[in-house]
Each structure stands twice: as C-alpha cells, then as structure tokens.
Amino acid sequence: MAVTACQGLGFVVSLIGIAGIIAATCMDQWSTQDLYNNPVTAVFNYQGLWRSCVRESSGFTECRGYFTLLGLPAMLQAVRALMIVGIVLGAIGLLVSIFALKCIRIGSMEDSAKANMTLTSGIMFIVSGLCAIAGVSVFANMLVTNFWMSTANMYTGMGGMVQTVQTRYTFGAALFVGWVAGGLTLIGGVMMCIACRGLAPEETNYKAVSYHASGHSVAYKPGGFKASTGFGSNTKNKKIYDGGARTEDEVQSYPSKHDYV
C-alpha cells in the first residue's frame, strides 16, 4: 500500500516537474529587463532560449527568433542542450514509469520487472531534474556576470555629452519555473527509487522444523531454499492508485503588424 502510494506520488510529482521543465524551456522570460535604478523606458525587453521579445507600452509585442546557431553564445547553447536532455530523459522516464506502476497490470509482467523499471525511471527523473537545475543555474550565472559587467559600464565612459541607455537583464520567471520544476522532478525520481526498494521482496526466512520419526532421529529442513537475489512476487494486497495530472498551457497571442518568423 505505502509502496504503491510512494510510486504513484513519485510519478505525479515527476510528471508535474517535467511539464514545468518543458514550460520553462519554451518560455520567453528567461531574462527580463532590469527596471531598478534605470530610466523608465516605454519598452520592456525580455529574452528566452529561442527568441528575444520587446513589449512596447502601446501593448504590442514583437518577438524575433535566434535564427543563427553558430552566432549564439556557447553558454546559451549549453543551456539549451541541458534543458533538452532533461526533457528527453524525463519523457522516457515517464514512459517507463507508466508501465512500472503497480496499479497498472500489463499482461503477466512480474513485480521484479516493475521494480527494475521503477528504479530506471527514478534514475532518469533524477538526472532529468539535475539537468534542468544545472541549465537554469548556468543561465542565472551568465546573467549575474553580464549584469555586473553592464553595471560597471554604466558608471564608466560617461564623459561624453550623449548618454546611452544601458539595458541590464535580471532573472526572468522561467528561471524560477525551471528551478522548481527541476527540484520536483528530482524529488519524484528519489520517490521512485524508494518505491523500487519496497517492490523488491525481502529475504524469506524459513525456520527449521524438526520432525521426529518414530524410529529415527532425523532433522528435516524443508526445501533447503536459498534466498533469492532476484525480485520475488509480492503477495500484498494491491490498491488501485488513480493519480492523474492534467496540465493546461495557455498561449497569449499579441497583435502584430509585421511577421518576423
């Protein structure tokens, strides 16, 4: 019962986490224009992994994709790679974990196989979560470095009469979504690994029983079974765990005068 709950909960938590990682990867607000201690501009700049956007005070938003691969910073490419690896591993982990769930019966699949699949998916979720956390952290570090560099530039080279507005970027919503989602996927993976231990049968201890024959004193140990190192069948009562997660993605479109795609 506890094993099923742990496995089911791990699956749901991981599902939410991976949905979050996907959402974070697709979001445009990885970095947003820093408004603190800056002139109030009538435009608001924000950037994602795939495109940069400008929202004007008029309400119109214009987004432009990064159409170059070679021209992009290596760090950005690395973050993209980490997030994609995280999503792929997470998606495979979800697929594997669906078949591993104790509440789902697939043919005559033994619990030993389910335990192995649960462990595999758990590890995949852990690695997926770590990839997402690493990706987001690398991007955050890049932002912090650039922020202080641009801050230094703001206070140097101001000798000329004409001032230039230095756009500084700070943490966007996607970073927080990514950190939380990565953490949830990681937690889900750990829960799956814990559930896997519960699915493995404990060593069956058979007490030696002495049978005294009328004429002989012979000690008889039944079976002489050796403790199996494999995963035996679990004869505990099974409770159906119905844990489903539903995610809805809302995409707001803005009016656009020109098509930049």
């Epitope: 224009q33 002139p39 109030v40 501009t41 009538a42 435009v43 700049n45 950037q47 940069s52 956007c53 400008v54 004007e56 005070s57 008029s58 309400g59 119109f60 214009e62 432009r64 004409v162 001032q163 230039t164 507005v165 756009t167 009016p255 005068k257």
Partner: antibody, heavy 117, light 113 residues
Framework: QVQLQESGPGLVKPSQTLSLTCTVS????????ISWVRQPAGKGLEWLGE???????NYNSALKSRVSISKDNSKSQVFLKLSSVQAADTARYYC???????????WGQGTLVTVSS | DIVMTQSPDSLTVSLGERATINCKSS????????????LTWYQQKPGQPPKLLIY???TRESGVPDRFTGSGSGTDFTLTISSLQAEDVAVYYC?????????FGPGTKLEIK
Amino acid sequence: QVQLQESGPGLVKPSQTLSLTCTVSGFSLTSYAISWVRQPAGKGLEWLGEIWTGGGTNYNSALKSRVSISKDNSKSQVFLKLSSVQAADTARYYCGRLSYGNSLDYWGQGTLVTVSS
Amino acid sequence: DIVMTQSPDSLTVSLGERATINCKSSQSLLNSGNQKNYLTWYQQKPGQPPKLLIYWASTRESGVPDRFTGSGSGTDFTLTISSLQAEDVAVYYCQNNFIYPLTFGPGTKLEIK
C-alpha cells in the same frame, strides 16, 4: 472606422480641476493604449501621460502631482483630470491612440480649454 | 528628461525641391532589445491634429506618400521630403518614444518659397 472625440468644459476657473473625456470608437480600450497631449495656442506639443490596456498609467513628471488618467472599458471612455489649473494650462487637449513604436496613429480633433476667472 | 531639439526652426523650400529636417535627442533612442530607434515624426497642418508620418525612425505609416523618408540612429535623426508638394506645408514634430516622459521636439515650420 477608428475615431476619438474629446469633450469637456471649454472654460475652467483657476485652482479648479479640469476634467476631460475621450470617447473612442472603432477599436477597444482593452487592445489599445491611449495618450493625452496638449498644445497651447501657437506653441508645440506636450505629452501629458498615457493609460495602458491593463489600466496602468504613466505621467509627465512635470505634472505628475496634478494629472490623473483613468478609463472605463465598457463605455469606451478615457478620462483626464488636471487639478489646480492655472492660466498656463490653457491649451488644446488631444487624446491619441498608441500604436507601433509607441507612436500615436489616430488623434481626436482636440478640445480647447481656457483657464480664466 | 530627454531634450529633443529640431533644426532649423523654419524652412523655406521651392516646390519639387528636397526638404530636410533634423532632430537631435539628448539620449540615445536606440533600444538594444530589437535594435530599433524609438523616434516618431508627425505633421501638423493649421487647425488640425498632428498626423503620424514615420515611426521607429524610418518606418513609414501606411498611407503616407513615399516622398517622406525617415533616417538616423541613436541621437541624430532626419526627415526628408524628396520632392516638396504644396500640401506638405505644415509644422513637423519629432517625438521621443523611448524614455518617459515622451517628449516632443519644438517643431519645424515648413513653407514654400
């Protein structure tokens, strides 16, 4: 078609509050921001402030303490209030629709406001 | 506040000739996010509200004749009328649409010689 029409009292006494209404048609205030601009006779244009689609506002710092802009989306109306008016506030007041590049693509005909006792 | 200056104050040009109006801002109007200059040009004829000619420093508003051209970047901008027509007699204003408050230039009065 897109239209903007300013309305309000043509004469306001000094130290009183000037209240103007901009009624729009042909578009929704939930999709477009509105800006207020004034022009004293024979002089240049002065930006007063704007109200965004979500209801947020930004005002000219020179008038910040005196100017207030609000709107009623259902009535397609935008309101300008300018308190403690003086003779220097005598001007033609325009409302305009914000478009690409934060430019004003449509303007009302303007309403002339005279501040005098 | 950004100070917008226009030159000349008034301009007299013959019909069919080229007219050039300059606008200078005290701060750059270039937005690094989209590499666009947030400067707008308006035309105002006597007794009428201003009319939008150019936005983003060089993008012509729909319906505006192609003899009107906007150029420039950063702090220096130019409005050019390639072949002056009688109906172009008006006052021309440039506007900062980048940093609040969104200030206007003092205007340039264009007349026919």
